[in-house]
């Protein structure tokens, strides 16, 4: 009865019907299993992990952008449990490619040992 | 009374889209599921999906999952489908029913009168 | 998704007469909850559908007792046992077991 339920909809049995799994709000992710027909009886939603973050809906939380670590970037906004964190300028001995493809992950500042002769961000 | 009454006939042209309203009296909308059905020319009746109007959460038959999106308006009571991407197979009477459900009982027990689309350039 | 096949397609009649649909489903419409959602539909001409028979034989209020269901499993039939001029049209076999829920081809019930 309930095998054509898509990803997030599981058979209501008081409908016969497909219906909507509940979606997470902003900071939550689902716990336990909703989908396909099926619903866990203990489905439901919890918040966030600390330094995770997610917009809602089925979503996983996921790790916020380390922007120093990583990026060797400044923190411009901290993630918290509904955003993820947004990157400023480059950390002190890093710049920043100029005409080089996004990445997956966005910018990414080199460090000035490579950087060209010149390079206004590792002069002085 | 319970009544469903639906939006007048359409014509439109290949690849535009059409919305179809379903306005609901007699009865507390939310109450119950507004599904819509497809009925080609002379032929069957096909199942598209429906729309709970308490939450706006709706299911579709996979058929429809690109085709068409259904809409409530609880302050007017009234149900709303956009068909998209429109192709002489589209053209048919489409109909909002309200499905009941109840002590392991479901069915459609009350229908609009239909709204006619023919898709023709 | 489950296929509902009517017999027959056509179906002529005399006032006064009997008639008999029959409605197969491409599977079991017995519900894990124990129920059958096999409904009928009546579409008169230029009409909306109305239902007349859910869950296989219990009729919607306001239809006359000439019209009666019966069947199980995936072997369904609509009987009315005196056809009037209010009856004719096209009738509808319908399942809501299964997700999604589907129709049959129609019967169209018409004078000879």
């Known amino acids: 009865e309930d095998s054509n339920c898509g990803e997030n909809e599981y058979h209501n049995q008081t409908t016969g019907l497909c219906q909507q799994c509940p979606p997470c709000r902003p900071g939550e992710e689902p716990y336990m299993s909703c989908g396909y027909g099926t619903k866990d009886d203990d489905y439901g939603c919890v918040p966030c992990p600390a330094e995770k973050f997610s917009k809602g809906g089925y979503q996983i939380c996921r790790r916020h952008k380390d922007c120093e670590g990583f990026f060797r970037a400044t923190v411009l906004t901290p993630g918290d449990m509904e955003n993820d964190a947004e990157c400023g300028p480059c950390l002190p001995g890093y710049y920043m490619l100029e005409n080089r493809p996004r990445n997956i992950y966005g910018m990414v500042c080199y460090s000035c040992l490579l950087a060209p002769p010149n390079t206004k961000e590792c002069v002085g | 009374e319970v009544q469903l009454q639906q939006s007048g006939p359409e014509l439109v042209k290949p690849g535009a889209s059409v919305k179809m309203s379903c306005k609901a009296s007699?009865?507390?909308?939310?109450?119950?599921?507004m599904h819509w059905v497809k009925q080609s020319h002379g032929k069957s009746l096909e199942w598209i999906g429906y729309?709970?109007?308490?939450?706006?959460?709706?299911s579709k038959n996979q058929k429809f999952k690109g085709k068409a999106t259904l809409t409530v308006d609880k302050s007017s009571t009234t149900a709303y489908i956009q068909l998209n991407s429109l192709t002489s197979e589209d053209s048919a009477v489409y109909y909002c029913?309200?499905?009941?459900?109840?002590?392991?009982?479901?069915?459609?027990?009350?229908w609009g009168a239909g709204t006619t689309v023919t898709v023709s350039s | 998704d489950v296929v509902m096949t009517q017999t027959p397609l056509s179906l002529p009649v005399s006032l006064g007469d009997q008639a008999s649909i029959s409605c197969r489903s491409s599977q079991s419409l017995v519900h894990s909850n124990g129920n059958t959602y096999l409904h009928w539909y009546l579409q008169q001409p230029g009409q909306s559908p109305k239902l007349l028979i859910y869950k296989v034989s219990n009729r919607f209020s306001g239809v006359p007792d000439r019209f009666s269901g019966s069947g199980s499993g995936t072997d369904f039939t609509l009987k009315i046992s005196r056809v009037e001029a209010e009856d004719l049209g096209v009738y509808f076999c319908?399942?809501?077991?299964?997700?999604?829920?589907?129709f049959g081809a129609g019967t169209k019930l018409e004078l000879k």
């Open positions: 007699g009865y507390s909308f939310t109450g119950y599921n």
């Open positions: 319908s399942q809501h077991t299964h997700v999604p829920p589907t």
């Open positions: 729309i709970d109007p308490y939450n706006g959460a709706t």
């Open positions: 029913a309200r499905y009941y459900y109840g002590d392991y009982h479901w069915y459609f027990d009350v």
